[in-house]
Interface confidence: low
């Protein structure tokens, strides 16, 4: 999987993380997980192996199987949302995943992140700094 090493967005704003995967994993379950340790992180949301979007509380996930990209959106960001997260793909045997650090800038603080032009409180990240974790 490929994804951004870190993303940042303002408090009360939203962020979108896009994670890319290789051909062959299209119909597998994709998930978004919180926690420093890969093996014990808390899965916040997951797909059902289809392109249907899922939403749970303030987090949503959508898989675009044609582009082999799944997108996670976190809304209404709070300071305590700042943590290490993982994009993952479930498979029989060890899952695949890549780590993403989420940074939440306190309200009023200057953000160095380029925002979406249509919503100054939403930052979209497609992984300009990519890491591989196959």
């Amino acid at each position: 999987i490929q994804g951004p090493e870190s993303v940042r967005a303002p408090e009360q704003g939203s962020l979108t993380v896009q994670c890319h995967y290789k051909q062959g994993w299209e119909t597998y379950i994709k998930w978004w997980c919180r926690g420093v340790r890969w093996d014990t992180c808390k899965i916040l949301i997951e797909t059902r192996g289809s392109e249907q979007g899922e939403k749970s509380d303030r987090v949503s996930i959508k898989d675009n199987q044609k582009d082999r990209t799944f997108t996670v959106t976190m809304e209404g960001l709070r300071r305590d949302d700042a943590d290490v997260y993982w994009c993952g793909i479930e498979r029989r045997g060890p899952d695949l995943g890549t780590q993403v650090k989420v940074i939440v800038d306190p309200e009023g603080a200057a953000s160095t992140t380029a925002s979406s032009p249509t919503n100054s409180n939403m930052a979209v990240f497609i992984g300009s700094h990519k890491r591989n974790h196959y």
Epitope: I29, W31, I43, E46, Q52, E54
Partner: antibody, heavy 113, light 107 residues
């Protein structure tokens, strides 16, 4: 053949918690999600959420967020649904269902002071 | 949340009748629609998934159709064991939601 066997009926007081178990057999436990659906007396069906037994991932209906916890024990092919802060409106039959195609027999939870 | 409505809420029919139950979703759910049968004191039983696919072991007199927001469950020739309550359910997005049910009674 696929079988889902649930724990027995429970009577609880308001404010208490209940934990219902669902033991699966006859298929590969980690390959299918397990859902929990409840049905109040004389009422319709209400989806509570699911657990993915392979990853442990859960999705809960917003209505139950913060009150429900679904867990699994892969060593015994059992899933659990715990509902806390019980109130009289939680009196219902609680069903586990494998991807909604096979269902347990149901567990009646009665909340009464 | 996606709201599911069913009509009629109840109906009386005779053995051999053709019975049609409709289900409407509050938004487009493509074909992510399932139908269940439930008898008193028993767990629901999946009849139709994906709007029109017959679940294994279910008699062919049951059929489903529709896409988008409007769906239909048809029992081509009602049998004595078919008197029950029928529910539709969407699995397009969470929370998955059920219709209020249609009770099929003996005339």
């Amino acid at each position: 053949q696929v079988q889902l066997v649930q724990s027995g009926a429970e009577v609880k007081k308001p404010g208490a918690s209940v934990k219902v178990s669902c033991k699966a057999s006859g298929y590969t436990f980690t390959n299918y999600r397990m859902h929990w659906v409840r049905q109040a007396p004389g009422q319709g069906l209400e989806w509570m959420g699911w657990i993915n037994p392979n990853s442990g991932g859960t999705i809960y209906a917003q209505k139950f967020q913060g009150r429900v916890t679904m867990t699994r024990d892969t060593s015994t092919s059992t899933v659990y649904m715990e509902l806390s802060s019980l109130r009289s409106e939680d009196t219902a039959v609680y069903y586990c269902a494998r991807d909604l195609d096979y269902w347990g027999q149901g567990t009646l939870v009665t909340v009464s002071s | 949340d996606i709201q599911m409505t069913q009509s009629p809420s109840s109906l009386s029919a005779s053995v051999g009748d053709r019975v049609t139950i409709t289900c409407q979703a509050s938004q487009d759910i493509s074909n992510y629609l399932n139908w269940y049968q439930q008898k008193p004191g028993k767990a629901p039983k999946l009849l139709i998934y994906g709007a029109s696919s017959l679940q294994s072991g279910v008699p062919s007199r049951f059929s489903g159709s529709g896409s988008g927001t409007d769906f239909t469950l048809t029992i081509s020739s009602l049998q004595p064991e078919d008197f029950a309550t029928y529910y539709c359910q969407q699995s397009y997005s969470t929370p998955w939601t059920f219709g209020p049910g249609t009770k099929v009674e003996i005339k």
